[in-house]
């Protein structure tokens, strides 16, 4: 009778992560008597995958009943495949021996390749906010994919970016891979509503790429422009002065009025108006009692925006002259404001 051969008909098997892999193996003879075992890898450190008689292998099932007398099908199924399962699997026939069974014949091996989807890309921006005209870096990370080939693109508001660097790790063979990319983005005043998108395409995604996004509203700081104007007389001895704070983002803003350098009132922006570009406008009023002043009054509107150093605009109020409408600053644009009267 011809000597037993162990046949593994599949040179390679490709399985998606989470699926079940079937590894086929048949023997050509029932002799010699002894068990079949499955290993991953070869040599002394090989990993035991299945032993039909001993050991705990909860993920492995046999295709046929190995206890049947004439069984020569030793194929197995491995459930819930992960990238860590990739490798070459050998079906090995043992001959009963003493004290231990002796390896008799091995199959040629079946290479199991695992296709694993990349994780959802995570986009992160700079830790601190930056102002328009500055360049900021965004990173995008995705993990756990296999095979290694992957494509990553960056977009800002639908427009593809070109200034980025991408690495796929590790460089050599691995069960799964990670991608890391850093893109540089120049901020503009209109970027409050902008989005940066990282798009990852991989063979496992069947043409439907994964996207990660970052809102530039989390990154940008648009500093305000200030304009202080004097309003028409309301009463013989009272003058109304307004400070228009325009085009700022985020909303966190504190305004202080100073009369001749002395703090008159401090308030926090609350009822603001939003512009189409996502920035905010706000207006604060100060009612000045002229009769309480003998000399000219220097009124200063001081604004601290988002924890940054204060910016200010001043207006000189002439006490000697009859209070007529006068302005110290020319308005840049005519925007609606939420008038807040505080006396």
């Amino acid at each position: 009778e011809e000597e037993l051969q162990v046949i593994q008909p599949d040179k390679s098997v490709l399985v998606a992560a989470g699926e079940t892999a079937t590894l086929r193996c048949t023997a050509t003879s029932l002799i010699p008597v002894g068990p079949i075992q499955w290993f991953r890898g070869a040599g002394p450190g090989r990993e035991l995958i299945y032993n039909q008689k001993e050991g705990h292998f909860p993920r492995v099932t046999t295709v046929s009943d190995l206890t049947k007398r004439n069984n020569m099908d030793f194929s197995i199924r491995i459930g819930n495949i992960t990238p860590a399962d990739a490798g070459t699997y050998y079906c090995v026939k043992f001959r009963k021996g003493s004290p231990d069974d002796v390896e008799f014949k091995s199959g040629a091996g079946t290479e199991l390749s695992v296709r694993a989807k990349p994780s959802a890309p995570v986009v992160s921006g700079p830790a601190a906010r930056a102002t328009p005209q500055h360049t900021v870096s965004f990173t995008c990370e995705s993990h756990g994919f296999s095979p290694r080939d992957i494509t990553l693109k960056w977009f800002k508001n639908g427009n593809e970016l070109s200034d980025f660097q991408t690495n796929v790790d590790p460089v050599g063979e691995s069960v799964s891979y990670s991608i890391h990319s850093t893109a540089k983005v120049v901020l503009t005043r209109e970027d409050v509503h902008s989005q940066v998108i990282c798009e990852v395409a991989h063979v496992t995604l069947q043409g439907d790429p994964l996207r990660g996004t970052a809102n530039l509203s989390e990154t940008i700081r648009v500093p305000p422009t200030l304009e202080v104007t004097q309003q028409p007389v309301r009463a013989e001895n009272q003058v109304n002065v307004t400070c228009q704070v325009r085009k700022f983002y985020p909303q966190r803003l504190q305004l202080t009025w100073l009369e001749n350098g002395n703090v008159s009132r401090t308030e926090t922006a609350s009822t603001v108006t939003e512009n189409k570009d996502g920035t905010y406008n706000w207006m604060s009023w100060l009612l000045v009692n002229v009769s309480a002043h003998r000399d000219d009054v220097k009124l200063t509107c001081q604004v601290e925006h988002d924890g940054q150093p204060a910016v200010s605009k001043s207006h000189d109020l002439k006490v000697s002259a009859h209070p007529k409408e006068q302005g110290s600053n020319t308005a840049a644009e005519n925007t609606g404001s939420n008038e807040r009267n505080i006396y």
Epitope: V33, G45, K53, H56, F57
Partner: antibody, heavy 114, light 108 residues
Framework: QVQLVQSGAEVKKPGASVKVSCKAS????????IHWVRQAPGQGLEWMGR????????KHNPKFHDRVTMTRDTSTSTVYMELSSLRSEDTAVYYC???????WGQGTTVTVSS | EIVLTQSPATLSLSPGERATLSCRAS???????LYWYQQKPGQAPRLLIY???NLASGIPARFSGSGSGTDFTLTISSLEPEDFAVYYC?????????FGGGTKVEIK
């Protein structure tokens, strides 16, 4: 569900033999080895041997020389472990365990005393 | 035969503490064949870890196994009251199958 049910406690005199049974249910009896493991009072676990229920093939711990005999009855899905020439040091709880090492019998206490 | 030496013999710890149990083999054991068990008084051993590092079904994630060759470790990240028991390592790489002498984890 998978079960290994062992025979009851035994008290034996030195020099006698004891035969402990282990009845399997809930799985294909010929699937895996059945091992025998013992534990003397306050001591650790000691592997005695195993039997392949499919063909009766056995392996045993050389420590027991030829004192241990393992057999099986496929008609009742039962394996047996017989220990001969008993001595006081053989006083122990004897466990049968399925080849996956997950399923164990409840244990059989064997006391050897004159 | 492969002799498995467990240390320490006794580990006195409080609930919430981390337990690290060692098992050293007299000759190299492929990880696939190294198992860990928990045993409580009057009960049969219970499989905790198979193939050196895989958690058996129903075993809490606070248990973990590691190691290769001749040095293996069982770690309990934060002891629960029900974890106080005796732990055994076991090899079935070669005949005769052997167990370590056990480590008793007791309440301090």
């Amino acid at each position: 569900q998978v079960q290994l049910v062992q025979s009851g406690a035994e008290v034996k005199k030195p020099g006698a033999s004891v035969k402990v049974s282990c009845k399997a249910s809930g799985f294909n009896f010929e699937d895996t080895y059945i091992h025998w493991v013992r534990q003397a009072p306050g001591q650790g676990l000691e592997w005695m041997g195993r039997i392949d229920p499919a063909d009766g093939d056995t392996k045993h711990n050389p420590k027991f020389h030829d004192r241990v005999t393992m057999t099986r009855d496929t008609s009742t899905s039962t394996v047996y472990m017989e220990l001969s020439s008993l001595r006081s040091e053989d006083t122990a709880v004897y466990y049968c365990a399925r080849g996956n090492y997950v399923n164990w019998g409840q244990g059989t206490t064997v006391t050897v005393s004159s | 035969e492969i002799v498995l030496t467990q240390s320490p013999a006794t580990l006195s710890l409080s609930p919430g503490e981390r337990a690290t149990l060692s098992c050293r083999a007299s000759s190299s054991v492929t990880s696939s064949y190294l198992y860990w068990y928990q045993q409580k008084p009057g009960q049969a051993p219970r499989l905790l870890i198979y193939s050196a590092s895989n958690l058996a079904s129903g075993i809490p994630a606070r248990f973990s196994g590691s190691g290769s060759g001749t040095d293996f470790t069982l770690t309990i990240s934060s002891l629960e009251p029900e974890d106080f028991a005796v732990y055994y390592c076991h090899q079935w790489y070669s005949y005769p199958r052997t167990f370590g002498g056990g480590t008793k984890v007791e309440i301090k």
